[in-house]
């Protein structure tokens, strides 16, 4: 079982390989000096049907380096960064993992593209392994709350309350969504 020639790349090169390309072979892409690699640089020859070989993902691309590009902080609700830090310049990558009791959909890594957007795929999502969700929490008088998403919230996520200036928060500042679908505490109040 073998794979066909790896997909070509413009303004870059492919690592050495011999033919036939055996299943298990890795080929690596790189870009010419003034270009930045966007996407996974390694492709693996696999077989899904034990008959034909296929490459496990699309080839990356080489973008002409844009020194003015910068990407915003990427947020994945229920997830956290395991690699990558600000500032995010053209070609920089960020890799995510999911919190406990969350599973990942999509690709764990994204790259800062010349258009100031993360790609070449969408940001991954972290989905709760529990079907239960906690209901949306109410806003409080003279205060605000921040949550990692809007509406009902998956177990493992939290909401943080704060009060307007001149008001004191009474109760729990951070309330966690439990795996039971219940909140860990009642909303606090803001008192003068």
């Amino acid at each position: 079982i073998s794979c066909g020639s790896p997909p070509p790349i413009l303004n870059g090169r492919i690592s050495y390989y011999s033919t036939p390309i055996a299943v298990g072979t890795v080929i690596r892409y790189s870009c010419s000096g003034t270009f930045r690699l966007i996407g996974e640089k390694s492709l693996l020859c696999i077989t899904k049907d034990k008959v034909d070989g296929t490459w496990d993902k699309p080839a990356p691309k080489c973008e002409y380096f844009n020194k003015y590009s910068s990407c915003p902080e990427p947020i994945v609700p229920g997830g956290y960064k395991i690699r990558g830090s600000t500032p995010y310049r053209h070609g920089d990558s960020v890799t995510f993992a999911c919190k406990t009791n969350f599973s990942m959909n999509g690709n764990k890594s994204v790259w800062c593209q010349a258009n100031n957007m993360w790609g070449p795929t969408r940001l991954p999502t972290c989905v709760s392994v529990f079907p239960l969700e906690c209901p949306a929490l109410p806003m409080i008088h003279n205060g605000h709350h921040t949550s990692e998403n809007v509406g009902s919230i998956a177990p493992g996520l939290s909401v943080t309350y704060s009060c307007e200036s001149g008001y004191l928060l009474v109760g729990e500042k951070i309330i966690n969504c439990l795996s039971s679908g219940k909140w860990s505490a009642v909303p606090p109040t803001c008192e003068e």
Epitope: S15, R28, L44, I46
Partner: antibody, heavy 119, light 106 residues
Framework: QVQLVQSGAEVKKPGSSVKVSCKAS????????ISWVRQAPGQGLEWMGR????????NYAQKFQGRVTITADKSTSTAYMELSSLRSEDTAVYYC????????????WGQGTLVTVSS | EIVMTQSPATLSVSPGERATLSCRAG??????LAWYQQKPGQAPRLLIY???TRATGIPARFSGSGSGTEFTLTISSLQSEDFAVYYC????????FGQGTKLEIK
């Protein structure tokens, strides 16, 4: 960080086989490749082959083709290297090593297993 | 297979001085090169990958450079714990290691 713990030292007779294990803890066993690298006494490092557990695909260095078998048990997060038709020149420390996402380099190594081949 | 040649076989340097280790590939390997440190009785430890990127937790005194066929590992100011054997490894086409350079105290 992934920890790789290997089985203990072995003494073998020429012509026999040896099977060394490498148990991984931490990280997702299926998502990385495990290579086997050996080092004869006072010598350098020599790549023998590697397996990608999630695919069950093993590849071997030409020198060891036909004599080495690398397998993995996903249920126990353990990789195995079996070397047959042993000769005295196979006396070495055998290491398992992990590469992440087909990176090509080894972030984590086992502690090594000394295999002595002697009559 | 791609042959990796390291030089010198042994390098004697005084603590606090700079050490420069070389690695040559038998054909172009782009930047697909890693450096490892190995001390007696221990497994190798990853220092540098992609020719010039320091691995997590590796001190800034270690730096790598080069691409194509010529590569260098530089240790800017040698500490006592840096005396060891250093190996380069290519991953352009499967995997091969250099024969090693022993860095010893002068």
């Amino acid at each position: 960080q992934v920890q790789l713990v290997q089985s203990g030292a072995e003494v073998k007779k020429p012509g026999s086989s040896v099977k060394v294990s490498c148990k991984a803890s931490g990280g997702t066993f299926s998502s990385y490749a495990i290579s086997w690298v050996r080092q004869a006494p006072g010598q350098g490092l020599e790549w023998m082959g590697r397996i990608i557990p999630i695919l069950g695909i093993a590849n071997y260095a030409q020198k060891f083709q036909g004599r080495v078998t690398i397998t993995a048990d996903k249920s126990t997060s353990t990789a195995y290297m079996e070397l047959s038709s042993l000769r005295s020149e196979d006396t070495a420390v055998y290491y398992c090593a992990r590469e992440d996402d087909s990176s090509g380099y080894y972030q984590d190594w086992g502690q090594g297993t000394l295999v002595t081949v002697s009559s | 297979e791609i042959v990796m040649t390291q030089s010198p076989a042994t390098l004697s340097v005084s603590p606090g001085e700079r050490a420069t280790l070389s690695c040559r590939a038998g054909q172009s390997i782009n930047s697909h090169l890693a450096w490892y440190q190995q001390k007696p009785g221990q497994a190798p430890r990853l220092l540098i990958y992609d020719a010039s990127t320091r691995a997590t937790g590796i001190p800034a005194r270690f730096s790598g450079s080069g691409s194509g066929t010529e590569f260098t590992l530089t240790i800017s100011s040698l500490q006592s714990e840096d005396f060891a054997v250093y190996y380069c490894q290519q991953y352009e086409y499967w995997y091969t290691f250099g024969q090693g350079t022993k860095l010893e105290i002068k």
